[in-house]
């Protein structure tokens, strides 16, 4: 079955604003795919769970992007 | 082995500024939070601040929110408490320590998670001592 | 005045268990975790409790903590005169974003 070309992406809108690191609940990074052209870093906010996309090419996400690929490159067989 | 050592204390006159220094060794400086915190004479424990160096961003007890400023340089796995004007009630010994750990799960799958761990602060620095005086 | 509560002193004969508490409130103990830290005469502090009730490798298995609603407990069982320290409590604030002490337990060994 021929994949999809539709683009969906999870992120609608992407919030510029700094989160503090003491209100995440956890980042989840959704890489660049068929269905979505662009990485996606989606942030759950430890009250009341709300989500929020950062902006993948701020210097906070770039540095924790680069900190990922540093670990799966370390674990990967 | 895994270390945090502080720097730059001392006698300082009231009015002047100063910085302290916190190196880091031993462990991935950008994969935790560094925290500053003091001990006045006689007196207990007391939390300062904090920075997470992989995103730059500092919190400061309301106390001191204002009076000082937390940084750190990624480059060099340091992390700074500076003044720009001294009080005789900043007399403290001053210790940094490690807290926050950012913890990648689900690594080798489409989805890796973030999470940042604070488990308490397990790794000090030895202290170093400012004493603000005329 | 610090915002966690703790007894100023405490006290035991070797081999004796005791216990130090720590008083709080719902912005702080009550929605986190706790954790001790022992203060040697002219040493840095060092954690001895994290999350509650859990100790880091190196800690002898004589500390242990507990956590109840507002308040948490570190209990010294098979007290050593190497024990004679200070003592602290903390965890974070909701209401004040940030960390909080207790004011210290000086604990002797008799």
């Known amino acids: 079955v021929p994949l999809s070309r539709t683009v969906r992406c999870t992120c609608i809108s992407i919030s510029n604003q700094p989160v503090n690191p003491r209100s995440l609940e956890k980042l989840e990074i959704i890489p660049a795919s068929q269905f979505c052209p662009r990485v996606e870093i989606i942030a759950t906010m430890k009250k009341k769970g709300e989500k929020r996309c950062l902006n993948p090419e701020s210097k906070a996400i770039k540095n924790l992007l680069k900190a990922v690929s540093k670990e799966r490159s370390k674990r990967s067989p | 082995q895994v270390q945090l050592v502080e720097s730059g204390g001392g006698v300082v006159q009231p009015g002047r500024s100063l910085r302290l220094s916190c190196a880091a060794s031993g462990f991935t400086f950008s994969s935790f939070s560094i925290t500053w915190i003091r001990q006045p004479p006689g007196k207990g424990l007391e939390w300062i601040g904090e920075i997470t160096p992989m995103f730059g961003i500092a919190n400061y007890a309301q106390k001191f929110q204002g009076q000082v400023t937390i940084s750190a340089d990624k480059s060099i796995s340091t992390a700074y408490l500076q003044w720009s004007s001294l009080k005789a009630s900043d007399t403290a010994m001053y210790y940094c320590a490690r807290d926050g750990r950012f913890d990648v799960s689900d690594l080798l799958t489409d989805k890796p998670k973030v999470t940042i761990n604070y488990n308490g602060m397990d790794v000090w620095g030895q202290g170093t001592l400012v004493t603000v005086s005329s | 005045q610090s915002v966690l509560t703790q007894p100023p002193s405490a006290s035991g004969t070797p081999g004796q268990r005791v216990t130090i508490s720590c008083s709080g409130s719902?912005?702080?103990?009550?929605?986190?975790?706790v954790n001790w830290y022992q203060r040697l005469p002219g040493a840095a502090p060092q954690l001895l409790i994290y999350n509650n009730d859990q100790r880091p490798s190196g800690i002898p298995d004589r500390f242990s903590g507990s956590k109840s609603g507002t308040s948490g407990s570190l209990v010294i069982s098979g007290l050593q005169s190497e024990d004679e320290a200070d003592y602290y409590c903390a965890s974070w604030d909701d209401s004040l974003n940030g960390r909080v002490f207790g004011g210290g337990t000086k604990l002797t060994v008799l």
């Open positions: 719902s912005s702080n103990i009550g929605s986190n975790t």
